[in-house]
């Protein structure tokens, strides 16, 4: 079953997934899709990595992470209910049948209509930490505690600090994350 | 104009090995992943292997896992299809076929295929 | 794996009449990832239908496809004497990908 993650019209979503790079440069190409995941690549495709970088893209969808350093958590910007849905975290590891798929369900809720300064609201329902072996059995999901309050005016450069602040080291140890090699 | 020819099929003893070939023209053959699809006589058709563009992403089906080994030369715009350890479930015509796709956006189908070629397995 | 399940085994129909063709799946398939392909004897399977309902490259208008979820129909609205033949549908939603058994189209 798809792990579910919230976010509010207007606002960016963001959608974790990790690998760890066998060696610092070594990249495994990556899609994002709109979907589930198929048996191969991505359907509907809004961002694609390759071995060097970011090769494909479209407006509203990026990685706000180091790639480079196998984060290639999606930012969708400016959500509309329209973003709700399934969407295709595939890291294409190469080999037979060796690539690890991750489907990841956004849900978009209506923004507030008058929001107080002093509201809080939910950055995310939760972050699970996803466990994958090379094998093929069923992710081992854990939600981690829940996420500090965070009010309207620090939401809106969330994603700008979540590079440089201790919660993307959190996050980065939150989302769903394989190691290679 | 875009093609796709196979060859390499033939009459072989149970245990035995074979190997296939495609050879494509007319279009990218590296932007493509590319699979083989087998149909046993008056059967329907059944898909074996697909092998990703770059070659490095590789899926066989359970029936010939171990067994049959997908491989491409993107320089020489071929596919191939070693089989090893044939079984008379084997014989069948073998198609390859081109798994279609749009640039950012992957459209699922088997847009290209070649005209077959012939495997038996019998002693 | 994704069993699909055609119906009927065998249509038989005349030229001009409209054919429906059903394609059911064991589990839910995204319509992104269920095509439609025409073999007729001898040659190779011919793509029509890829994401459920969009017409491949030189396919006439009077085929079209439908559905979601687990059911899926294959039209050809008018029938031609060419389009007697074996249909397909197929997934691409889970591995392995998977075929249905075939539909065949005969001229009553």
């Known amino acids: 079953s798809e792990v579910e993650y919230r976010a509010e019209v207007g606002q960016n979503a963001y959608l974790p997934c990790f690998y760890t790079p066998a060696a610092p440069g070594n990249l495994v190409p990556v899609c994002w899709g709109k979907g589930a995941c198929p048996v191969f690549e991505c359907g509907n495709v809004v961002l694609r990595t390759d071995e060097r970088d970011v090769n494909y893209w479209t407006s509203r969808y990026w990685l706000n992470g180091d790639f480079r350093k196998g984060d290639v958590s999606l930012t969708i910007e400016n959500v509309t209910l329209a973003d709700s849905g399934i969407y295709c975290c595939r890291i294409q590891i190469p080999g037979i049948m060796n690539d690890e798929k991750f489907n990841l369900k956004l849900v978009i809720k209506p923004a507030k209509v008058t929001p107080a300064p002093t509201r809080q609201r939910d950055f995310t329902a939760a972050f699970p930490r996803m466990l994958t072996t090379r094998g093929h059995g069923p992710a081992e999901t854990q939600t981690l505690g829940s996420l500090p309050d965070i009010n309207l005016t620090q939401i809106s450069t969330l994603a700008n600090e979540l590079r440089d602040s201790r919660l993307a080291n959190d996050l980065r140890d939150s989302g769903a994350t394989i190691r290679i090699g | 104009q875009v093609q796709l020819v196979g060859s390499g099929g033939g009459l072989v003893k149970p245990g035995g090995s074979l190997r296939l070939s495609c050879a494509a023209s007319g279009f990218t053959f590296s932007d493509y992943y590319m699979s083989w699809i087998r149909q046993a006589p008056g059967k329907g058709l059944e898909w074996v292997s697909f092998i990703s563009g770059s070659g490095s992403i590789i899926y066989y089906a359970d029936s010939v896992k171990g067994r049959f080994t997908i491989s491409r030369d993107n320089a020489k715009n071929s596919l191939d299809l070693q089989m090893n350890s044939l079984r008379a479930e084997d014989t069948a015509v073998y198609y390859c076929a081109r798994d279609g796709m749009v640039r950012g956006m992957n459209f699922y189908g088997m847009d290209v295929w070649g005209q077959g070629t012939t495997v038996t397995v019998s002693s | 794996e994704i069993v699909l399940t055609q119906s009927p085994g065998t249509l038989s129909l005349s030229p001009g009449e409209r054919a429906t063709l059903s394609c059911r799946a064991s589990?839910?398939?995204?319509?992104?990832?269920l095509a439609w392909y025409q073999q007729k004897p001898g040659q190779a399977p011919r793509l029509l239908i890829y994401g459920a309902s969009s017409r491949a490259t030189g396919i006439p208008d009077r085929f079209s496809g439908s559905g979601s979820g687990t059911d899926f129909t294959l039209t050809i609205s008018r029938l031609e004497p060419e389009d007697f033949a074996v249909y397909y549908c197929?997934?691409?939603?889970?591995?392995?990908?998977?075929f249905g058994q075939g539909t065949r189209l005969e001229i009553k």
């Open positions: 589990q839910s398939v995204s319509s992104s990832y």
């Open positions: 197929q997934q691409y939603g889970s591995s392995p990908i998977t």
